[in-house]
Each structure stands twice: as C-alpha cells, then as structure tokens.
Interface confidence: low
C-alpha cells in the first residue's frame, strides 16, 4: 500500500515567496519621479520578480521630529494622493502582489519613534492600522522597534488589531539588533509577528559561522515561521562583497521562511559604486541613464535592462530562485536539515513528504573545495542519494539538469549549488 500523504500546513500568502521593500519611492523610480502613480507602472517589473508582497514606504506625512505634524492617516502629497494609493492597491491586487505599508512614524527624524510622547505615538499607530486595514492594505511594517519603549506589548496590541481584522494580514517588525536573545524576547510575546533584524549581517563569510547562526535561530524559534534578510532595511551590498551576493540570494530563497529583500538587491545595487548616492537608498539602476551624474559610472550589466536579457546575471538568478521558491512544496514548507560538508561549506536539505527534494551546498570560501557530504548527520527521512540533478549553480558554465555524483561534488570559490532529487520510499 502507498504511504499516506502528510497533511499540508496552512499557508499564508507571505509563506509562498519573497517580500520586496521599497523604502524610498524617489530613489526606486529615479529621474526626479517617485510617486505612487509611477510605482504603479513598475508593478509588471515586480511581477517579473515573482515576489509576493511589496513593503512600501513610509509615505505618510511626517515633519521631522514633530509629533503634531506627523499624520499616519495622510499620504505626503509629494508621493501622491489617497486615490493614487487606492489605484496602486487595485493594480497590485490584480497582479497578485500584496501591499504592506510601513508606518514607522518619524521616518524623517532622528528617533523613528520620537524620544517622548510614546503613548501619543502608539495611539496614532493604532488608529492608522484600523484606517489602512479598511483601505485594503495587506499588512504593516514598523521599524527601529529597539527605539520603542515597551515594544513587545505595543506589538502584541497592534498584532491583535491586524489579525482581528483578518488572519490574512501581516505585521512586520524591524530591529537593528543582531542579538538572538533580544530577538527571541520580541518574538516570544507575538505569535505571528514577522521580524526582520541584523541577525545574519555579521555572519561574516564563513560557512561554519553562517551554518551555526542559521541552525541556532531555527532551533531557538521552534516551529514558528521566520523571515530571512540581512537587515531591516538596507541593501545586501551594505554587508556583502559582490562575490557573495549570489550565494546569499540562493541561501535566503531556500531557507525555511520568508525571504525579504530591498529594491536593488536583485541586481546587486551598490551605493558605493554610485558617488554621492546615500548608502541607505541609492537610485535604482533601471538602465544606464538612471545615474546621469557621472557619465560612464554605470555599465549595462549593473542595470535592470542589462541584466534582464542576460541569463547569467544576478537578476536572472533572482527570478529563477523566486520562481522555484514559490512553486516547490519542499521549498515552500519543507523540513530543514543542515549537515556537515567540510570546512567553509554550509549544506542543507529541504524536503516535504513524497515531493521532490532539494540539496543546497554553499561554498563561502575563497578557494575551490570538494564537498564531503556527511549523510550520517541526517535522519533516515532525509537521506541523500548517490546522484542529484543540478537545478542551478550561482556560477556560469555548469550544465544545468545534469546528474552530479554527490561523492565527487566540487565547488568553485563562492559557488552555491541547488540540486534536486526525487523522494525514494
């Protein structure tokens, strides 16, 4: 008799793929544009990335450090009108893109939560949640919660409002903290909260350390749903050298949880390569004319246009990973098992019941390595086959689809492999 199928877990929309943050509308659109109407015109691009949600803003009225002149119910006219926002919501819905609104109050000021009048601000947030839920947003983000006194209790209250409206609504909290204990204390009192933090930002570039951080986090959080990013707002290039971007894309898309990216992560947007651009929100490079300040500073392969047509680009890799992440059961909600593969390497299996299984092998090192996959670390339910098919490599030149003998696996410096193999009873 065939074995019984394992019951599928309840899947919320944010479990099914990546979130894409656009914190600065003007930088994202460039050319002095930067409003909600213009963003609507970029939704097809977001669709092509196969992201599930857009984390937008903040876009509310905020006079720097002035509580009285901060109105979370009003859109800053520089960004457009409530009608523009409604139109964006409708268009996004048609394209199956959810919209999450950032309500971090004092986003133009020194302290995101103002240094005093915490209760006044908290009340404003509460009113804003109810207002924007009625307007049709799919969730909210609040950042810098380490600056919010009694953050846990406020988050619990806001979570209740959000979930009370619909279980299908999401609350994201962001913190600059990378301390696991602080992160866990925020999570403990808030069951469905999605938390972005700097936890992985100091993973350095060793496979062992990254493996240790990931496994510690997963063990500590138990069965709760995680999110994966390197910070609450900043670009991957703020933390990583260019040669590790592909590796991290592969890792973030294949760990169990929701990957969260900032605009530009998909092309390796790097403020350091654009003189005069702010580190936290450089202009998005749609094409070579996006940064006219210094002629020749931008080459085609740094842009969306240039990378869109190149199957070997970071953007093409992002699209492929995003596609796999959103359609494979083992990547959507499969079990995770990390195991030893040798110094400098981080490897793990994702598997769900009798569905196709995935093996990820990541070489964080500067030298080519042979992988010694220690299958003895794995439970019987997740055993390794002798061969697996190469689904993709972060490096060009691999024959995709070819079967690789796992005993003879060799990885180039900074190479990541995603391999697939069938369930075997």
């Amino acid at each position: 008799r065939a074995p019984r199928c394992r019951e599928l877990p309840a899947q919320k929309w944010w479990h099914t793929g990546a979130l894409y943050r656009i914190g600065d509308l003007q930088a994202f659109q460039g050319h002095g544009a930067g409003n909600l109407a213009g963003l609507k015109g970029r939704l097809d691009y977001l669709s092509s990335l196969k992201v599930k949600g857009l984390v937008l803003g903040p876009i509310h009225k905020n006079q720097k450090d002035d509580v009285a002149q901060t109105d979370l119910l009003q859109i800053d006219p520089n960004f457009g009108s409530k009608e523009d926002f409604d139109s964006l919501l409708q268009s996004a819905k048609k394209k199956s893109i959810r919209v999450i609104l950032d309500l971090t109050p004092n986003y133009r000021g020194e302290n995101s939560w103002f240094s005093t009048q915490v209760d006044t601000v908290a009340t404003k947030v509460k009113d804003a949640l109810e207002f924007w839920l009625q307007a049709g947003v799919d969730g909210f983000q609040v950042r810098d919660i380490e600056n919010l006194k009694d953050a846990s209790s406020f988050l619990a209250e806001w979570q209740n409002i959000t979930k009370g409206f619909s279980e299908d609504r999401l609350l994201i909290a962001g913190t600059n903290s990378s301390d696991l204990q602080q992160i866990l204390s925020l999570l403990e009192s808030n069951k469905d909260l999605l938390l972005t933090s700097s936890y992985l930002s100091d993973s350095g570039s060793t496979g062992e350390h990254t493996k240790s951080l990931v496994t510690q986090y997963l063990n500590a959080t138990g069965n709760r749903w995680c999110s994966w990013s390197l910070s609450q707002a900043r670009l991957l290039t703020s933390f990583l050298p260019a040669q590790l971007l592909r590796l991290y894309q592969l890792m973030l898309f294949t760990l169990p949880g929701t990957p969260v990216f900032s605009y530009g992560d998909e092309i390796g947007l790097d403020a350091a390569a654009l003189p005069g651009q702010p580190m936290e929100a450089p202009v998005m490079l749609w094409d070579e004319s996006s940064f006219p300040d210094i002629p020749g500073a931008v080459s085609a392969n740094m842009t969306v246009k240039g990378q869109s047509e190149d199957p070997g680009s970071l953007l093409s890799l992002f699209r492929r990973l995003s596609d796999q992440r959103s359609k494979e059961r083992s990547l959507l909600h499969g079990d995770f098992h990390a195991f030893s593969a040798g110094p400098g390497l981080f490897s793990y299996i994702r598997h769900w019941d009798q569905n196709e299984r995935f093996l990820v092998v990541l070489n964080f090192g500067d030298v080519g390595l042979s992988a010694g996959l220690q299958a003895s670390d794995l439970p019987a339910s997740a055993s390794l086959p002798a061969k697996a098919d190469l689904l993709l490599s972060t490096q060009p030149g691999r024959e995709e689809g070819s079967p690789l003998e796992l005993e003879r696996l060799k990885l180039e410096p900074h190479e990541g492999l995603l391999l697939r193999f069938p369930y075997a009873a």
Epitope: K305, D310, D323
Partner: antibody
C-alpha cells in the same frame, strides 16, 4: 525601418569553419539582443545562439562546443562562427532580433533576416 | 530542455475553411502571478523567413489579420485561422520563451486540398 541581412559563403567544405555576418539597421545592438537560428531543408527551426547588449552570449548546448557569436556594435554587425562542419549542417541560417518592450526583454523575435543558404559538401 | 510538440504535422485545407492546430509543451508556460503564457506563434511562407504572428499565446502582432487567433494556457495551446485564405498557406511554428533555451516546435504545414 528595422532590417537584418545575413551574408556568408553558399558552399563550405566538410570539416571547415563557417563564418556568417548579420548586418542590422534601424536599431542599435546596444539596445537589442540578436539570435541565430538555422533551418535544414524541409525541417524545423533550431535556436543556435544569442548575443546580448552587454556582449554576454549563450549557446544551444548541443552546438556549444562548435559555436562562437560576436559583434561589432560600431559596424552594427553580429557574427557567427561554426567549426567542424558536416553535411547535416546544411541549412538556411537566419539572424533575428529579440523583442524588447522598453523595460524588459522577452524571448520572442519580432524581426528576422531573409536567411542565407549554406551547403556543406565536398 | 522543454519539448514543444505540434500536431498535426501537415493539414490540407480549402479556402474559407476554419483551421486549428495544436502545440503542447512538456512544462507549463504559464506564470500564475502575471497570468501570462510565454508562447509565440510564427508563420513561414515558402522561401521566406519566419514572421511573428502571436505572442503571450493570444496577443496578435500589429498588422496580423484578426482571422488569426491564439488560445490556450499552461501546456496546451491552439492557433486558429477562422477562414483560411490562399496567402495563409505556410508552415506555422510555436515557440516557448519561459525557459532558456527557447525551443520551437517542429511546425504544422498548411497545404491546399
């Protein structure tokens, strides 16, 4: 208006190298990718290679070891070299332009050259 | 690589007749988030180069007569010519552009009865 025109030898000896040129006008190679496709007599279309606007290339895996695609943007020309020709490489060779909608490239081809017939025979 | 299978390989028709031809792909060409099918149809008349007819499975290229209609989704697609004209006698190819490398079908040849 947009035009692509292939040129090359009509006859090539077996084991020799084929060199083809695709001259384009009405658009820039800095903005569009160009592909080569071939069609043996009475048979279907086979995608061979592409050169993208950044100069990156991709090849049909079955022909990869024998192919080389390149371009000269200033001359608006794309070149295809294919070595170790055999009689089964007898075909009409076309170049075509990748579709581009201003933001994103899609893998269908809106303009084609008229083709050049290449016979491999001794 | 994706395999594109076209049927029939040839079809004899009379002018004014309605014609349908099929194209099946070995993997789905539908991306559910934008609800688009990454499939194109080309027409190749004798002695000529292929000409783009339809993209996104059902969008006619400008200048293509409205008697040509593309339909289908996922793995099964159809090209219909509502009333065949003499100038429509040609080979019709489907092509997927969802996955790299882009693959063509073997073609359906339209001939006069």
């Amino acid at each position: 208006q947009v035009q692509l025109k292939e040129s090359g030898p009509g006859l090539v000896q077996p084991s020799q190298t084929l060199s083809l040129t695709c001259a384009v006008s009405g658009f820039s190679l800095s903005n569009y990718g160009v592909i080569w496709v071939r069609q043996p007599p009475g048979k279907g279309l086979e995608w061979m290679a592409v050169i993208w606007t950044n100069g990156n290339t991709n090849y049909n895996s079955t022909l990869k070891s024998r192919l080389s695609i390149s371009r000269d943007t200033s001359k608006s020309q794309v070149y295809l070299k294919m070595n170790s020709l055999q009689t089964e490489d007898t075909a009409t060779y076309y170049c075509a332009r990748h579709y581009y909608d201003g933001t994103y490239y899609y893998g269908y081809f809106d303009y084609w050259g008229q083709g050049v017939m290449v016979t491999v025979s001794s | 690589d994706i395999v594109m299978t076209q049927t029939p390989s040839s079809q004899a028709v009379s002018a004014g007749e309605k014609v349908t031809m099929s194209c099946k792909s070995s993997q789905s060409l539908l991306y559910t988030e934008n609800k688009k099918n990454y499939l194109a149809w080309y027409q190749q008349k004798p002695g000529q180069s292929p000409k783009l007819l339809i993209y996104w499975a059902s969008t006619r290229e400008s200048g293509v007569p409205d008697r040509f209609m593309g339909s289908g989704s996922g793995t099964d697609f159809t090209l219909t010519i509502s009333s065949v004209q003499a100038e429509d006698l040609a080979v019709y190819y489907c092509q997927q552009y969802y996955y790299f490398p882009y693959m063509f079908g073997a073609g359906t040849k339209l001939e006069l009865k």
